[in-house]
Amino acid sequence: AESHLSLLYHLTAVSSPAPGTPAFWVSGWLGPQQYLSYNSLRGEAEPCGAWVWENQVSWYWEKETTDLRIKEKLFLEAFKALGGKGPYTLQGLLGCELGPDNTSVPTAKFALNGEEFMNFDLKQGTWGGDWPEALAISQRWQQQDKAANKELTFLLFSCPHRLREHLERGRGNLEWKEPPSMRLKARPSSPGFSVLTCSAFSFYPPELQLRFLRNGLAAGTGQGDFGPNSDGSFHASSSLTVKSGDEHHYCCIVQHAGLAQPLRVELESPAKSS
């Protein structure tokens, strides 16, 4: 449950967007779940996945939209401060986390072309960093009407308030557990060897463990792959190279919060895996 106690906005702006693509976009995350998306082409904050059904107050998404339009303006202003050089990608990670004592810990850091270079200092109420680019951007942002105050308000009040609201109103989403559907398949590899692939589909939360057994004994975790699905669930797979003809000695064990106990997955027969 602790991983759910954070609300983070991942903001990205590009100085030279490709035609028809946004110059600025945001994904909002409640723990490991994306609940919000925004981009400069649509200009509206929208709920994602199961959060479409959250019983929110009528003006909630208008407020998210207003705040993100302000952020969009700031981020695109930053490129003007940097001058004509580039291209640039500016990223922000803004949000808050609820500690064990229910106090809020804010986060506000920024990266330029993939390098963290600036933060927002709550005590000093200003953006900090010592790269020349950080000074140029922070100077520009300080000149925007009440920008620093708005950032403080966002981090210290709006964010924890929203997080607590979601914890109340969206508890069903946060407690969602979807067990994985599983497959264990074999395919020929280099001469004399096969690759066993254990695949887990459509599970949530994202924490999942895959491992192989050979005749009941641990045979390793293999080479893994992991990623999100468009509906908010996740997929994962792990592959292990074994001797040809030895495949039937292996099985895959999966552990996941949606399963009452670890699940043993046997190798599919060749006919079934077609």
Epitope: N113, G114, E115, F117, D121, Q124, T126, W127, G128, G129, D130, W131, P132, E133, A134, L135, A136, S138, Q139, Q142
Partner: antibody
Amino acid sequence: EVKLVESGAELARPGASVKMSCKASGYTFTSYAMHWVKQRPGQGLEWIGYINPSSGYTNYNQKFKDKATLTADKSSSTAYMQLSSLTSEDSAVYYCARKGLRYAVDYWGQGTSVTVSS
Amino acid sequence: DIVMTQSPSSLSVSAGEKVTMSCKSSQSLLNSGNQKNYLAWYQQKPGQPPKLLIYGASTRESGVPDRFTGSGSGTDYTLTISSVQAEDLALYYCQQHYSTPYTFGGGTKLEIK
């Protein structure tokens, strides 16, 4: 030409305070962070902290948090460092240095020598 | 704090010889996202402030002779002087700009025989 000119040598009593200056010229003062570095006689370099002259934002080495106070005056393009509650450990040369690059400070002042003696 | 360790603490060479000095950090100074290293080398001659030689581990500051070369990545860095000149008599410091507090190595003193 970028120049950082620091104030003259200081002789101070233990317990006193000193305030040294670093006047910048040849560039836009508010566009670059000003760092301060300490060097005791025959010793290495120690980073004290930096100030962003445009906003007044400061970042200190915890070791110097209660010792040094960094300020900047935009109108005169001058950065200042005040050292308080001086002891013999504070006897050193103090440098101001501009961070004109992402990964280094590129220009240094000539240094201000502080001697603490009773 | 990141600890920077330089070696040797001093070395004595004849003019024209090649010199290498080492700087090791207690944690990586490499930004894996863009392969940039947050390390600089400075030269300090007696009675003078330090002077920037190399930044980003390997980029020579303008006006610095090309006999000075910086290399390395992660936690291990090297400054090489390909053919030492009499005017290279100085202390050489490395400094990390990866995270505050920015820390310096203890320095390597180069003496000319």
